[in-house]
């Protein structure tokens, strides 16, 4: 049901990583407009992007109130210039997205190796806490402080001149481990929710190498 | 483990009034919206009112509308029904239910009696 | 209001039949119903919502089809405890409305 030449969204999709989040849709628009709705189970709906012609949504600002909740959005259709117009029920066409849970869904983003520091035969490997736009107090958290221990990472390093990769894992965002005096190393992470069912892993990271800026080298 | 809890039915006179409670247990109450469903007896079910979880929103089958009052008490984990000008049609078991994003029911109460009769 | 018709109204069937009990709306309400079931003298108990995801807690024997006007129910293998009444319920749009209602007895 729904208005004359008014079609329902399909095909909703939420976006997310570290917790930036967008609602996408389809169709394009032909001669209506959308606007979305979010709520979590409170039904406390709340409108967002109104009457666009756009076919996504930036919720962030919704779901950065309580990462935890679960939420539900709904894109209503509307006639373009007419957007009173109801269908034969008296509402709106619309369709309801998945579920999403921010803290249990939302990607990892591809981490940064911030820095790393050889000190003899050891080697500290620092990754760089991206700030999320999850606000605590009027400052923004950072993806640790979000995640807390549920957060770890998985370095990767190997030896410049050879292909057999060791690893390692914290739940801190600093490693320190053993190397052979006088090789060259190149190291890559990658964040994991262990927890998680779905998205447990971001990307790896981009591999820095030993001999190149990011790094320090001192001869103890 | 989740709890809802109806009291406050009985035996009420034509355009007499009642007020129904819900106490709930096992879960954050403010996250959810709750509502009131009634059973007339050996009939079907029929949806009587809904409220969202901040109580800023209401919403009422025409069967009642004008008569009934559905609101919440947050900090006492309680859903309430004020039931005003009775007819012998309000006649029912009334069960409050938790309704996740205001949609569908998820769990019950085991029900009041509502019972409206000269 | 969006009617809800359920059928058949009653049902005898047998313990490790599958037994499936349609639903239809008077008009489109896309994937926005749930389905109850309900024992004599007891309140309601959530089986399925939006049309096909199986309420936490309950047999994995049940489960919800259909998009639009038409829906299902089937429970693939009757268990003695499944004998009730079973109700489809739209929340599309308020008035939220039930189905009348389907009993399913022991043949």
């Known amino acids: 049901s729904g208005t004359t030449n008014t079609v329902a969204a399909y095909n909703l999709t939420w976006k997310s990583t570290n917790f930036k989040t967008i609602l996408e849709w389809e169709p394009k628009p032909v001669n209506q407009v959308y606007t979305v709705q979010i709520s979590t189970k409170s039904g406390d709906w709340k409108s967002k992007c109104f009457y666009t012609t756009d076919t996504e949504c930036d919720l962030t600002d919704e779901i950065v109130k309580d990462v935890k909740q679960t939420y539900l959005a709904r894109v209503f259709s509307y006639p373009a210039g007419n957007v009173e117009s109801t269908g034969s029920a008296g509402e709106p066409l619309y369709e309801n997205s998945p579920e999403f849970t921010p803290y249990l869904e939302t990607n990892l983003g591809q981490p940064t190796i911030q820095s790393f520091e050889q000190v003899g035969t050891k080697v500290n490997v620092t990754v760089e806490d991206e700030r999320t736009l999850v606000r605590r107090n009027n400052t923004f958290l950072s993806l640790r402080d979000v995640f807390g221990k549920d957060l770890i990472y998985t370095l990767y390093y190997w030896k410049s001149s050879s292909s057999g990769k060791k690893t390692a894992k914290t739940n801190t965002n600093e490693f320190l481990i053993d190397v052979d005096k006088g090789e060259n190393y190149c190291f890559s992470v990658q964040a994991v929710i262990p927890s998680r069912t779905v998205n447990r892993k971001s990307t790896d990271s981009p591999v820095e190498c030993m001999g190149q800026e990011k790094g320090e080298f001192r001869e103890i | 483990e989740v709890q809802l809890l109806e009291s406050g039915g009985g035996l009420v006179q034509p355009g007499g009034s009642l007020r129904l409670s819900c106490a709930a247990s096992?879960?954050?109450?403010?996250?959810?919206?709750m509502s009131w469903v009634r059973q007339a007896p050996g009939k079907g079910l029929e949806w009587v009112s809904s409220?969202?979880?901040?109580?800023?929103?209401?919403y009422y089958a025409d069967s009642v509308k004008g008569r009934f009052t559905i609101s919440r008490d947050n900090s006492k984990n309680t859903l309430f029904l004020q039931m005003n000008s009775l007819r012998a049609e309000d006649t029912a078991v009334y069960y409050c239910?938790?309704?996740?994003?205001?949609?569908?029911?998820?769990?019950w109460g085991q029900g009041t009696l509502v019972t409206v009769s000269s | 209001d969006i009617q809800m018709t359920q059928s058949p109204s009653s049902l005898s069937a047998s313990v490790g039949d599958r037994v499936t009990i349609t639903c239809r709306a008077s008009?489109?309400?896309?994937?926005?119903l749930a389905w109850y079931q309900q024992k004599p003298e007891k309140a309601p108990k959530s089986l399925i919502y939006?049309?096909?995801s199986l309420q936490s807690g309950v047999p994995s024997r049940f489960s919800g089809s259909g998009s639009g006007t038409d829906f299902t129910l089937t429970i693939s293998s009757l268990q003695p405890e499944d004998f009730a009444t079973y109700y489809c319920?739209?929340?599309?749009?308020?008035?939220?409305?039930f189905g009348q209602g389907t009993k399913l007895e022991i043949k």
């Open positions: 939006a049309a096909s």
């Open positions: 096992g879960f954050t109450f403010n996250n959810y919206a």
């Open positions: 319920q739209q929340y599309n749009s308020y008035p939220y409305t």
């Open positions: 239910a938790k309704t996740p994003w205001g949609y569908y029911f998820d769990y």
């Open positions: 409220i969202s979880g901040s109580g800023g929103r209401t």
């Open positions: 008009q489109g309400i896309s994937s926005r």
